[in-house]
Amino acid sequence: DAEFRHDSGYEVHHQKLVFFAEDVGSNKGAIIGLMVGGVVIA
C-alpha cells in the first residue's frame, strides 16, 4: 500500500491497515482495518 504525507497534495482514500490483536487484548493474530479519508474504520 502506498503511503503519502497528508500535506503532499495526495489524498489517501482507501488503505488497508493492520493491527496486532495482542496490542488490545490477549488474542493473537492480525486485525484488518480500513482507513478512509484519514479515519480508521473497522
Partner: nanobody, 124 residues
Framework: EVQLVESGGGLVQRGGSLRLSCAAS????????MGWFRQAPGKEREFQAA????????YYADSVKGRFTISRDNAKSTVFLQMNSLKPEDTAVYYC?????????????????WGQGTQVTVSS
Amino acid sequence: EVQLVESGGGLVQRGGSLRLSCAASGRTFSNLNMGWFRQAPGKEREFQAAISRSGGTTYYADSVKGRFTISRDNAKSTVFLQMNSLKPEDTAVYYCAAASPGGPINYGRAYDSWGQGTQVTVSS
C-alpha cells in the same frame, strides 16, 4: 527513542538468500512492535513484514509472503528478516523500524524509530 542498527545486506544472485539483522538499544525491546520496510530507487517506502512484541504474531506484505520470515530474540534485542528465493525486484534499501503498540503495523508513519538501512542487491 530506540536506536536501531541493521546488518546483513549485500549482493546475491537470483534465487539466493540473505538474513538481515537489526540490533536495538535505548528502550525495552520487548515492549515494541518491530517491522521491516524497503525502498527501491525512485519508489515509495513499502512495508515488508512485522512482528508483535511477544513474537507470537507476524504479518507480511503479499509480495514476500512465503519467501520472507521475520523473527525476533527479545533476550538479545534483535529482530531478523530471513529472505529466501530472492528476485531482482527485491533490490532495495531495507529498513528496520520500531513502533509502540497499538498502531497500524503496516503503516510507516506509525513507526517512531528507524535504522539507517542496509542495501540488498539481487542480480539476475
